[in-house]
Interface confidence: low
Amino acid sequence: GHWGAWMPSSISAFEGTCVSIPCRFDFPDELRPAVVHGVWYFNSPYPKNYPPVVFKSRTQVVHESFQGRSRLLGDLGLRNCTLLLSTLSPELGGKYYFRGDLGGYNQYTFSEHSVLDIINTPNIVVPPEVVAGTEVEVSCMVPDNCPELRPELSWLGHEGLGEPTVLGRLREDEGTWVQVSLLHFVPTREANGHRLGCQAAFPNTTLQFEGYASLDVKYPPVIVEMNSSVEAIEGSHVSLLCGADSNPPPLLTWMRDGMVLREAVAESLYLDLEEVTPAEDGIYACLAENAYGQDNRTVELSVMYAPWKPTVNGTVVAVEGETVSILCSTQSNPDPILTIFKEKQILATVIYESQLQLELPAVTPEDDGEYWCVAENQYGQRATAFNLSVEFAPIILLESHCAAARDTVQCLCVVKSNPEPSVAFELPSRNVTVNETEREFVYSERSGLLLTSILTLRGQAQAPPRVICTSRNLYGTQSLELPFQGAHRLMWAKIGP
């Protein structure tokens, strides 16, 4: 043999119980000691440091801390140095060294030593990662190194987490013993933070010890808080909330059309939209994500606003008889009431639509004029004016005539036309045609679609002359012999000498 000792490098026991530190030693055979003695020291292997003596086989003298609390269970003659320590208190925790004493110079303090840990809580071993929905094994492990007191294990707060499996007393690698109880269960997200306890009780004593572990159950996010659809008036402030339950906390992301608007690692996240515009109307998505999964939900934001100024597309110049189609369109939320007026008369209207089509089949000159398209909802009203110009051949109105007074004849020719026509007065008896350009004889004035031309003739005539008014534009020509009326029918202003 050779000098050497074998004992567990570490051993633990509950406060108030006892501990048996298993120990064997060896020495060279040729020494053949008559008696083998031994000493157990506390915390230092060197006698010159005067460490506390735990046990000494030569005498009963021990340090006061170990008085009546230490006993050798092993037979030193059989090279067994097993030590029993009773009524353990925290100050007995530390290093224990054995010194073999074979007499004479043959004394040897072994460098191998045991570290005693005095504990007061069972050790609950939870896997480093506990994931909801995946079976997990939680163990409760307590030292069982006191031959006088054997622990009994029970679980606390395990209701609904399955039935324990007691493995019983197991020998560890270095010869120490443990009692082990296992709990197999499939955790749910609700089990997160659950306080699971293990109790070690020593029968026929008041000694009982409890240890607890809080389950840190990892689970994917579930969005639990989210606005339902939101209606907001243009210009107002909108706050969208997304709240998720997960462990660890999720990365919350607010998105719209695939674009990230805001994100943070948090249980809830607001998306604040200041002074919303119609452009912000749409679907907003909240994505909650952690290492264990993701969830997403959407909310629809509807921005309410007054109609935009209507736009008018279509014919604004038409030829008499043509069909005119005019489209008035706008944008609003909700959709507006659209109306097309002409001189306070409603020509067409639609309710809750964004466009209105006005159809005028075979337009007449009476359709010419100013029109209004009005869009209205509960948030406001906007209107757009447009003009329809109807083009047609000249019409000489029946009010056209001639009248004589003393030495003057005046002929009035009133023409309705679009575009403006040319007017000429023909005197067949004199083989003369007077155009409107001849300002000395013709005065013309236009008002709207009416052109009034007045021909003034001076000098005495035996009989009133025949006067024919001819009006012409690109759509046609009309002529009318102007009837003479009695002098009393007209007020004449004498022009010239």
């Epitope: 660890p248 990365l251 943070a264 690692v265 948090a266």
Partner: antibody
Framework: EIQLVQSGPELKKPGETNKISCKAS????????MNWVKQAPGKGLKWMGW????????TYADDFTGRFAFSLETSASTAYLQISNLKNEDTATYFC???????????????????WGQGTLVTVSS | NIMMTQSPSSLAVSAGEKVTMSCKSS????????????LAWYQQKPGQSPKLLIY???TRESGVPDRFTGSGSGTDFTLTIINVHTEDLAVYYC????????FGTGTKLEIK
């Protein structure tokens, strides 16, 4: 340049309330937590707790619950320590010190205090 | 809380000498998942605020001279200053930031 500038020294009577400010500059205020550390005259350092500048959530050490309150004015990049019902044993220099926040909750990653304020001496005496 | 004990409480050396100071924690500050020691060293000169020297037990903060070296793991740590300068006069604190943050009792370095 990263700086934490604290308010000036204070002389207070027992029972009064004191509020110390710590203005940060040279970095993004909300990317770093703000710690408060107490140093009694001639003594060592004692951690009082910290405030998460991103969420506003304070965490107090066991000995500093009740009379002590951490707060923020994020827009001004300023953290505050308020001590109410002052006692003689509150006489000390109080330091603010920043440390990185890890929003993703990875355990203990990098909670070392790298920049400190110059300290504010609070003297409590009747 | 994890208790941090520093030794010696004070020491005096001449400029140019090497100095070591110790810091022991009541529990290990080695975090198993990343194998990092959550221990820092600070220097506090008279009338000044603490200055970070070392973090992760051995990583030197930028701008700190390479005369300062941190070592150790678990519960036992050492700060070594080689070629001590007169401006190194200060109190040196170790600090664990694994659990509720605690500081060591401090080691006062005086220059002879």
């Amino acid at each position: 340049e990263i700086q934490l500038v604290q308010s000036g020294p204070e002389l207070k009577k027992p029972g009064e309330t004191n509020k110390i400010s710590c203005k940060a500059s040279g970095y993004t205020f909300t990317n770093y937590g703000m710690n408060w550390v107490k140093q009694a005259p001639g003594k060592g350092l004692k951690w009082m707790g910290w405030i998460n500048t991103y969420t506003g959530e304070p965490t107090y050490a066991d000995d500093f619950t009740g009379r002590f309150a951490f707060s923020l004015e994020t827009s001004a990049s300023t953290a505050y320590l308020q001590i109410s019902n002052l006692k003689n044993e509150d006489t000390a220099t109080y330091f603010c010190a920043r440390n990185p926040i890890n929003y993703y909750g990875i355990n203990y990653e990098g909670y070392v205090m790298d920049y400190w304020g110059q300290g504010t001496l609070v003297t409590v005496s009747s | 809380n994890i208790m941090m004990t520093q030794s010696p409480s004070s020491l005096a050396v001449s400029a140019g000498e090497k100095v070591t100071m110790s810091c022991k924690s009541s529990h290990s500050v080695l975090y198993s998942s990343n194998q990092k020691n959550y221990l820092a060293w600070y220097q506090q000169k008279p009338g000044q605020s603490p200055k970070l020297l070392i973090y992760w037990a051995s990583t030197r903060e930028s701008g700190v001279p390479d005369r300062f070296t941190g070592s150790g793991s678990g519960t036992d740590f050492t700060l070594t200053i080689i070629n001590v300068h007169t401006e190194d006069l200060a109190v040196y604190y170790c600090h664990q930031y694994l659990s509720s943050l605690t500081f060591g009792t401090g080691t006062k370095l005086e220059i002879k």
